[in-house]
């Protein structure tokens, strides 16, 4: 049965329209030639930045060996969408597929890959390529996790107290401070799946004059600093 390799290969490139594009196609180790009738399913968790293009790949099997190629797409709150190509008749068929941004990369008889143009939060879900051969099926599944970069702000709201916010990130960002203070952190969950994290810190020690808020997120990290003034100071804002 097909077994996953330990190493994942993440390719990132720029397309002509300046939209970042990533493709996750991992090599698998075939450890036996005695194929079982239903071959092992390989699943990959894949974080993808919002507003990029994504390409999802099928197992590496030449068209001459195939009967049907099917992409099954399960998105939250929607009926399962299937895109199928039947080699014998050279026909493609779609069932319950409404998102026009999810398409075959090209003609399925030339390339079985699936592409998502301009990934949105709604593309969070499970994508599976099923390759039907005369001796069983090969599967490749992707748990697609759409990442949203939070907007980071840092400001002083009262004497020796600073507030750092990571607004509308997905998943939730993690906020830490240098130096550590007396902190309280709150999370606010939005209906679109994003989370706002708010960390409020107070420093009693008067020799602390500058504090740094460090925001860790899957899309990248960001640090902002502020001087603790007797009165509220200038507001700092930045994207990761």
């Amino acid at each position: 049965a097909a077994q996953p390799n330990n190493s994942l290969m993440l390719q990132t490139s720029k397309e002509n329209h300046a939209l970042a594009s990533s493709s996750l196609c991992m090599d698998e180790k075939q450890i036996t030639q005695n194929y079982s009738k239903v071959l092992a399913e390989v699943n990959t968790s894949w974080p993808v930045k919002m507003a990029t293009n994504a390409v999802l790949c099928c197992p590496p099997i030449a068209l001459r060996n195939l009967i049907i190629i099917t992409w099954e797409i399960i998105l939250r709150g929607q009926p399962s969408c299937t895109k199928a190509y039947k080699k014998e008749t050279n026909e493609t068929k779609e069932t319950n597929c409404t998102d026009e941004r999810i398409t075959w990369v090209s003609r399925p008889d030339q390339n079985s890959d699936l592409q998502i143009r301009t990934v949105a939060i709604t593309h969070d879900g499970y994508y599976r390529c099923i390759m039907v051969t005369p001796d069983g099926n090969f599967h490749r599944g992707y748990h697609l996790q759409v990442l949203v970069t939070p907007e980071v702000t840092l400001f002083q709201n009262r004497n020796r107290t600073a507030v750092c916010k990571a607004v509308a990130g997905k998943p939730a960002a993690h906020i830490s401070w240098i130096p550590e203070g007396d902190c309280a952190t709150k999370q606010e969950y939005w209906s679109n799946g994003t989370v706002t994290v708010k960390s409020t810190c107070h420093w009693e020690v008067h020799n602390v004059s500058t504090v740094t808020c460090h925001v860790s997120h899957l899309t990248g990290n960001k640090s902002l600093y502020i001087e603790l003034l007797p009165v509220p100071g200038a507001k700092k804002s930045a994207k990761l």
Partner: antibody
Framework: QVQLVQSGAEVKKPGASVKVSCKAS????????MHWVRQAPGQGLEWMGY????????NYNEKFKGRVTMTRDTSTSTVYMELSSLRSEDTAVYYC????????????WGQGTLVTVSS | DIVLTQSPASLAVSPGQRATITCRAS??????????MHWYQQKPGQPPKLLIY???NLESGVPARFSGSGSGTDFTLTINPVEANDTANYYC????????FGQGTKVEIK
């Protein structure tokens, strides 16, 4: 285990035809594409074409089109490669090889059949 | 058709040393993140034997002394360390749609 057994050596005259057989065992015969490759004495490997026993699809190397025919007999799990209008340069060892699905690699080969074309 | 060019044509290596064979394709044999390039070993009077598939995957039962690398158009087969019974011809092959082999590299052990 998976095995491919080819027919014995042949000696043919120029202009004649030869039909080489490749009998498969140890797996579901109709499930895997079979390729034919030849190797002239002291030379490299040359792909001739393939047959898919599942649906009888064939695809031949342009070089051999019109001269080569690949067929299969599902009752005996055997594929055949027939080459016509033989010339001396067709003298070679002819191999059948089974294509495994994953990666389209050839993991199982026949032992080879020597075809000698001589007047 | 894709043309595969192997180099060198022949190679003499001492036991324990490294042998490197390269294969260059006239156009990319990689698609969907996979490189449909395989390496075979052929000893006199025997059919070829699969060593490496999809550029870098070791076929079951093949010693780890054999390794493959590369993508796109440039590929390498490495034998390290070489042993006496590695004397053979080595062929690269691509298998995406129409298939071709490299012309072969003869490896001799000194």
């Amino acid at each position: 285990q998976v095995q491919l057994v080819q027919s014995g050596a042949e000696v043919k005259k120029p202009g004649a035809s030869v039909k080489v057989s490749c009998k498969a065992s140890g797996y579901t015969f109709t499930s895997y594409v079979m390729h034919w490759v030849r190797q002239a004495p002291g030379q490299g490997l040359e792909w001739m074409g393939y047959i898919n026993p599942y649906n009888d699809d064939t695809n031949y190397n342009e070089k051999f089109k019109g001269r080569v025919t690949m067929t299969r007999d599902t009752s005996t799990s055997t594929v055949y490669m027939e080459l016509s209008s033989l010339r001396s340069e067709d003298t070679a060892v002819y191999y059948c090889a089974r294509e495994d699905y994953y990666g389209s690699r050839w993991g199982t080969w026949g032992q080879g059949t020597l075809v000698t074309v001589s007047s | 058709d894709i043309v595969l060019t192997q180099s060198p044509a022949s190679l003499a290596v001492s036991p324990g040393q490294r042998a490197t064979i390269t294969c260059r394709a006239s156009k990319s044999v990689s698609t969907s993140g996979y490189s449909y390039m395989h390496w075979y070993q052929q000893k006199p009077g025997q059919p070829p034997k699969l060593l490496i598939y999809l550029a870098s995957n070791l076929e079951s039962g093949v010693p780890a002394r054999f390794s493959g690398s590369g993508s796109g158009t440039d590929f390498t087969l490495t034998i390290n360390p070489v042993e006496a019974n590695d004397t053979a011809n080595y062929y690269c092959q691509h298998s995406r749609e129409l298939l071709t082999f490299g012309q072969g590299t003869k490896v001799e052990i000194k």
